[in-house]
Amino acid sequence: MRRERGRQGDSSSCERQVDRVNLKPCEQHIMQRIMGEQEQYDSYDIRSTRSSDQQQRCCDELNEMENTQRCMCEALQQIMENQCDRLQDRQMVQQFKRELMNLPQQCNFRAPQRCDLDVSGGRC
């Protein structure tokens, strides 16, 4: 069993919902878009791979959450936090944030109006 169970508490909370979904396809999808032909990422070779693979699964996972501004923002913040240490410079951080904010639209969801993606104590 490899799944981490959600935290205890209100099962309808955004925190629990974000815990239950697999955000890795979203992370890979964005990394692929900003890295293109660069080296391997996370042991999964994103070179010459269609981004639509990751995008379909990513959208499916985001769709599992209640489509609220707050929950979507929490998911985006979690993706940012997960990938923060892999982003090599300021430019890459900004690219990642830009793609991340476009993600809900790509999945035909409402984008959160205000979502602070400055996570990891300002590192990202």
């Epitope: 069993m1 490899r2 169970r5 239950r20 996370d42 999964y44 791979t49 269609r50 990751q54 379909q56």
Partner: antibody
Framework: EVQLVESGGGLVQPGGSLRLSCAAS????????MNWVRQAPGKGLEWVSS????????YYADSVKGRFTISRDNAKNSLYLQMNSLRDEDTAVYYC????????????????WGKGTTVTVSS | EIVLTQSPGTLSLSPGERATLSCRAS???????LVWYQQKPGQAPRLLMY???TRATGIPDRFSGSGSGTDFTLTISRLEPEDFAVYYC?????????FGQGTKLEIK
């Protein structure tokens, strides 16, 4: 013990209907995507349909689209496959399978399978 | 639809030998979404490998997976009697989640 048990198979005439059920036990059913996979006699595996945890996303193979309907009842720990307008080529063993993912790296996989239920479409 | 073609259709080898099974995709597949299953007669399929190269729980280390893009390989370094079965690759990144037609590994 983690277990999936399919039921509802049987002999049906072409054009007929059948509803398959899959009873899950030993795990938190609502935490997993679920799939139906079939295998015609002497043939390979064919993915049929999948449904996400909350039922918000559903996919079908082209061969069954418009005829089969997947659904789930998380309160009853059950997965269903409603099969209408059945054809000879739908004859197969139908497996219910749980889909999990590796939380650290992300890949998906079907890690728990039922023993299958046999559907025979014949006049 | 992504078509997965497995080769050879049948592989005849002896215990102790090395088996190399191929899975070729009609379009590029992220190795994140490439899975291998083993099936024995009268049994349900069993998960072997996911993410193209990660062994499932309880799978011995004689099984290994590799590949990316359109070409993937399952290797069994030293065949044991219980390894003779049918092997299927599957892509589960883009619906429909297609399987290959299978490779039958039989005792020579």
């Amino acid at each position: 013990e983690v277990q999936l048990v399919e039921s509802g198979g049987g002999l049906v005439q072409p054009g007929g209907s059948l509803r398959l059920s899959c009873a899950a036990s030993g795990f938190i059913f609502s935490d997993y995507n679920m799939n139906w996979v079939r295998q015609a006699p002497g043939k390979g595996l064919e993915w049929v349909s999948s449904i996400t945890r909350s039922s918000r996303t559903i996919y079908y193979a082209d061969s069954v689209k418009g005829r089969f309907t997947i659904s789930r009842d998380n309160a009853k720990n059950s997965l269903y496959l409603q099969m209408n307008s059945l054809r000879d080529e739908d004859t197969a063993v139908y497996y219910c399978a749980r889909e999990d993912f590796d939380v650290s790296t992300g890949p998906y996989y079907m890690d728990v399978w039922g023993k299958g239920t046999t559907v025979t479409v014949s006049s | 639809e992504i078509v997965l073609t497995q080769s050879p259709g049948t592989l005849s080898l002896s215990p102790g030998e090395r088996a190399t099974l191929s899975c070729r995709a009609s379009q590029s597949v992220s190795n994140m979404f490439l899975v291998w299953y083993q099936q024995k007669p009268g049994q349900a399929p069993r998960l072997l490998m996911y993410g193209a190269s990660t062994r499932a729980t309880g799978i011995p280390d004689r099984f290994s997976g590799s590949g990316s893009g359109t070409d993937f390989t399952l290797t069994i370094s030293r065949l044991e009697p219980e390894d003779f079965a049918v092997y299927y690759c599957q892509q589960n990144g883009n619906s429909p989640y297609t399987f290959g037609q299978g490779t039958k590994l039989e005792i020579k």
